[in-house]
C-alpha cells in the first residue's frame, strides 16, 4: 500500500502572454497521494468550476481561458490540497496582449485661425500603443505649436492657414498597427480687407471707381454702403481668385459721400466683418451744391444744433435721396475726425463745417444756399487750424490720408465770395467774431507775404498775430 504523500507542484505556473479572443492555458502539475483537490484563483478570487468562460481538466491541473478578454489579465494561482501536510500554491501572471485599436478616432474639424484645435485619437492595446500622426502623405513633426498629447490626441495651438489638410492617427505596438480614417482640418479665416478703397476729390458729374479687396475663408462677400445706406446707384463688379475677393464700385458723382466697403464671411452661426471707408468729395462743392436743387428748412439734426443760428433756415440738397440724413451723416463723420485736432482748431472747424454743410438759405422761388464768407474760411484755415490744414495738405500731396481733417467736407476758401465785395452774399461765422475779440495767446509771427487780391486778410503762413489790419467786422 502507497504511503500518503503531501502535494508537490512539479511544474510551477509561468507568465502567460495571450492575445484577446485567443485561448490561454495555465498548467499546474501536482504529485501527491492521495490525489489532491486543485482549486484556481484569479487575483485571490476563487474561479468557480461552473464558469463557462473557463475549462478545468486533467483533475484540475489544466486551466484554460477559452476566449481571452482584456479584463482577464491578473495573477492566477493553483492551490493543491490532499489532507496530508499543508496546501501548496503556485502563481503566474496572465498578460493580455492586444493589437492597437483606435477607440475614439479623429473627426472633421472646422476651426478659426488663431484658435486651438484638438483632434482626438484614443487607443487601446497592450503593450500600450505609441500614437503618431500623418498629415497628407507625410509624418507630422511636433513643434512649439503642434504636440501629440499623452492621450494620443493632436493639439495645434494658434492654428494657421497652412495647418489645413487631411490628417490620420497611427497607433502602433509590437503586435501591429492601426490607422484611423482620414479626417479634414479646415481653417477658417476672419474676413480682412487687403486693399481699402481710396478717397477721391473729383469734379461734379465725373466717374469714380472705388476698389476694395478682401480675404478670408470662406471667401467673404463684399457689400458697399453710401452715407450709411445701401448704395442706391452705381455698378459693382466682383472677381474671386485664391480666396481673395476684389470688388469695384463704379459711381457717377453728383454729390459727396462716405463709401464703406464691408467684407463679411460666416463661421458656423457667427459672422465676421471688416470695414474700410473712403470719401468722394467734389471739387468746388459749394458751386455744385448751389447749382443743384434743394429746399430751405430748419435744421433738425443733433451735431450742428449748438453751432447753427437758432431757427435759421438751412439748405438741404435734394440730390441726396434723404438730404437731412445724408448731410447729418457727413457732418457726424467729420465731427469724429475733429477729435484729433487741437482745442484751438476744433470749435472753429466745427463752425466752418456746419455752416458749409448746412448753408444758410434764402427761401425764394429758387431756394438759394448762402456760402460762408471767404474771410471766415481763411481765418479757420490760416489762423485757428493752420497746423492741421498744413499737415492735411502735405499728406494730400504725398497721397497719404490718415489724420485729423482729411475726411472733412471743407470748402475751398478761394472760391468763396468775399464779404468786402457783397456782405449780403455770404454767411459770417459769429463764433470767429467772438474769438477774434478774445484771442490773446496766438504766436506773434506776422505775415511776410501780404495778400494782394483781398484786403484785410492774413497771408498763408502757419501762424499769425491778430493785427488791426485783420478785420472781420
Amino acid at each position: 500500500e502507497k504511503l500518503p504523500k503531501a502535494p508537490v507542484i512539479t511544474t510551477p505556473l509561468e507568465t502567460v502572454d495571450a492575445l484577446v479572443e485567443e485561448v490561454a492555458t495555465f498548467m499546474c502539475a501536482v504529485e501527491s497521494y492521495p490525489q489532491p483537490e486543485i482549486s484556481w484563483t484569479r487575483n485571490k478570487i476563487l474561479i468557480k468550476l461552473f464558469d463557462t468562460r473557463y475549462s478545468i481538466r486533467e483533475n484540475g491541473q489544466l486551466l484554460t481561458i477559452l476566449s481571452v478578454e482584456d479584463s482577464d489579465d491578473g495573477i492566477y494561482c493553483c492551490i493543491a490540497n490532499n489532507g496530508v501536510g499543508g496546501a501548496v500554491e503556485s502563481c503566474g501572471a496572465l498578460q493580455v496582449k492586444m493589437k492597437p485599436k483606435i477607440t475614439r478616432p479623429p473627426i472633421n474639424v472646422k476651426i478659426i485661425e488663431g484658435l486651438k484645435a484638438v483632434l482626438p485619437c484614443t487607443t487601446m492595446g497592450n503593450p500600450k500603443p505609441s500614437v503618431s500622426w500623418i498629415k497628407g502623405d507625410n509624418a507630422l513633426r511636433e513643434n512649439s505649436r503642434i504636440a501629440v498629447l499623452e492621450s494620443g490626441s493632436l493639439r495645434i495651438h494658434n492654428v494657421q492657414k497652412e495647418d489645413a489638410g487631411q490628417y490620420r492617427c497611427v497607433a502602433k505596438n509590437s503586435l501591429g498597427t492601426a490607422y484611423s480614417k482620414l479626417v479634414k482640418l479646415e481653417v477658417e479665416v476672419f474676413a480682412r480687407i487687403l486693399r481699402a478703397p481710396e478717397s477721391h476729390n473729383v469734379t461734379f458729374g465725373s466717374f469714380v471707381t472705388l476698389r476694395c479687396t478682401a480675404i478670408g475663408i470662406p471667401v467673404p462677400t463684399i457689400s458697399w454702403i453710401e452715407n450709411g445706406n445701401a448704395v442706391s446707384s452705381g455698378s459693382i463688379q466682383e472677381s474671386v481668385k485664391d480666396r481673395v475677393i476684389d470688388s469695384r464700385l463704379q459711381l457717377f458723382i453728383t454729390k459727396p459721400g462716405l463709401y464703406t466697403c464691408i467684407a463679411t464671411n460666416k463661421h458656423g452661426e457667427k459672422f465676421s466683418t471688416a470695414k474700410a471707408a473712403a470719401t468722394v468729395s467734389i471739387a468746388e462743392w459749394s458751386k455744385s451744391q448751389k447749382d443743384s436743387q434743394g429746399y430751405c428748412a430748419q435744421y433738425r439734426g443733433e451735431v450742428c444744433d449748438a453751432v447753427l443760428a437758432k431757427d435759421a433756415l438751412v439748405f438741404f440738397n435734394t440730390s441726396y435721396r434723404d438730404p437731412e440724413d445724408a448731410q447729418e451723416l457727413l457732418i457726424h463723420t467729420a465731427w469724429n475726425e475733429l477729435k484729433a485736432v487741437s482745442p484751438l482748431c476744433r470749435p472753429a472747424a466745427e463752425a466752418l463745417l456746419c455752416n458749409h454743410l448746412f448753408q444758410e438759405c434764402s427761401p425764394g422761388v429758387v431756394p438759394t444756399p448762402m456760402p460762408i464768407c471767404r474771410e471766415y474760411c481763411l481765418a479757420v484755415k490760416e489762423l485757428f487750424c493752420a497746423k492741421e490744414w498744413q499737415a492735411m495738405e502735405g499728406k494730400a500731396h504725398r497721397g497719404l490720408y490718415r489724420s485729423g481733417m482729411h475726411l472733412l467736407p471743407v470748402p475751398e476758401c478761394s472760391k468763396l465770395p468775399s464779404m468786402h465785395r457783397d456782405p449780403t452774399a455770404c454767411t459770417r461765422l459769429p463764433y470767429l467774431d467772438y474769438k477774434k475779440e478774445n484771442i490773446t495767446t496766438f504766436p506773434s509771427i506776422t505775415s511776410s507775404r501780404p495778400s494782394a487780391d483781398i484786403p484785410n486778410l492774413p497771408a498763408s503762413t502757419s501762424s499769425f498775430a491778430v493785427s488791426p489790419a485783420y478785420s472781420m467786422t
Partner: antibody, heavy 121, light 112 residues
Framework: ELQLVESGGGLVQPGGSLRLSCAAS????????MSWVRQAPGKGLEWVSA????????YYKESVKGRFTISRDNAKKTLYLQMNSLKSEDTAVYYC??????????????WGQGTLVTVSS | QAVVTQEPSLSVSPGGTVTLTCGLS?????????PDWYQQTPGQAPRALIY???SRLSGVPSRFSGSFSGNKAALTITGAQPEDEADYYC????????????FGGGTKLTVL
C-alpha cells in the same frame, strides 16, 4: 421682417415707476432715430420722446420732462422709456416707433403694437 | 405752445376726392415744420403715409398726396376707397426753443 415689440406696461399706482422696453429686429437698429408715442384710451396720438441713432441727445414733451428718460442700447437693439412719478394722465397705450433716418425727428415709418400703461390707485 | 389743428371729421364718397388740412393755432405751417401724415384704423398701430410735406412712403398708394394749401399743410385723397376710412393725424416739427414733434387732434374720415 422689421419688428418692434414693446413690453413693460401694466398697472401702477400714481407716483410709481415703470420701465418700457422696445426690442427691434429686422433692420440695422443703430442707423435710425427712435421715438415713443402714446395714445390715451379713445384719444389722439401724443408724441412723448425721441432719441437719435447714436443716443447723443434726448428730446421730451414738456409735460414729461424730468419724469421720463429715453435711452437706447444699440448692442441689444433695444429702446427704453423709464417713467417715474407717474400720473393718472400718463395712462395710455405706449408705442415705440422708428424714424425714417438717423436724426431724432421726422416721419415715424414703423410702429410696434403698443403696450398699455394704466396709472390708477 | 402752439396747437396743431385738424378737422374733427370729414366724409367722402367712394371714388371721390377729399382734402384734410393741418394748421397751427398761431402762425402758418411751413416746410420748416416738416408736415407728416399718419393713418390709423381701429385697433391698429398708426401707419406713416406722407413725410416732409409731400414725400410718399413706400407702399403708400398714389391716391394719397401731400401739399401746402394757404397757410396749412394738406393731405389729399383722390379716388377714395372704403379701406381709407380711418383716423388721420398730421404731425409737425416745432423747432423753436425746445424741440418737439406735435400731433394734431386727428380727423375721422368716413367713406360713405
Amino acid at each position: 421682417e422689421l419688428q418692434l415689440v414693446e413690453s413693460g406696461g401694466g398697472l401702477v399706482q400714481p407716483g410709481g415707476s415703470l420701465r418700457l422696453s422696445c426690442a427691434a429686429s429686422g433692420f440695422t437698429f443703430d442707423d435710425y432715430g427712435m421715438s415713443w408715442v402714446r395714445q390715451a384710451p379713445g384719444k389722439g396720438l401724443e408724441w412723448v420722446s425721441a432719441i437719435p441713432w447714436n443716443g447723443g441727445s434726448t428730446y421730451y414733451k414738456e409735460s414729461v420732462k424730468g419724469r421720463f428718460t429715453i435711452s437706447r442700447d444699440n448692442a441689444k437693439k433695444t429702446l427704453y422709456l423709464q417713467m417715474n412719478s407717474l400720473k393718472s394722465e400718463d395712462t395710455a397705450v405706449y408705442y415705440c416707433a422708428k424714424r425714417s433716418g438717423r436724426i431724432a425727428f421726422g416721419a415715424l415709418d414703423a410702429w410696434g403694437q403698443g403696450t398699455l400703461v394704466t396709472v390708477s390707485s | 405752445q402752439a396747437v396743431v389743428t385738424q378737422e374733427p371729421s370729414l366724409s367722402v364718397s367712394p371714388g371721390g376726392t377729399v382734402t384734410l388740412t393741418c394748421g397751427l393755432s398761431s402762425g402758418s405751417v411751413t416746410s420748416s415744420n416738416y408736415p407728416d401724415w399718419y393713418q390709423q384704423t381701429p385697433g391698429q398701430a398708426p401707419r406713416a403715409l406722407i413725410y416732409s410735406t409731400n414725400s410718399r412712403l413706400s407702399g403708400v398708394p398714389s391716391r394719397f398726396s401731400g401739399s401746402f394749401s394757404g397757410n396749412k399743410a394738406a393731405l389729399t385723397i383722390t379716388g377714395a376707397q372704403p379701406e381709407d376710412e380711418a383716423d388721420y393725424y398730421c404731425a409737425l416739427y416745432m423747432g423753436s426753443g425746445s424741440r418737439n414733434y406735435v400731433f394734431g387732434g386727428g380727423t375721422k374720415l368716413t367713406v360713405l
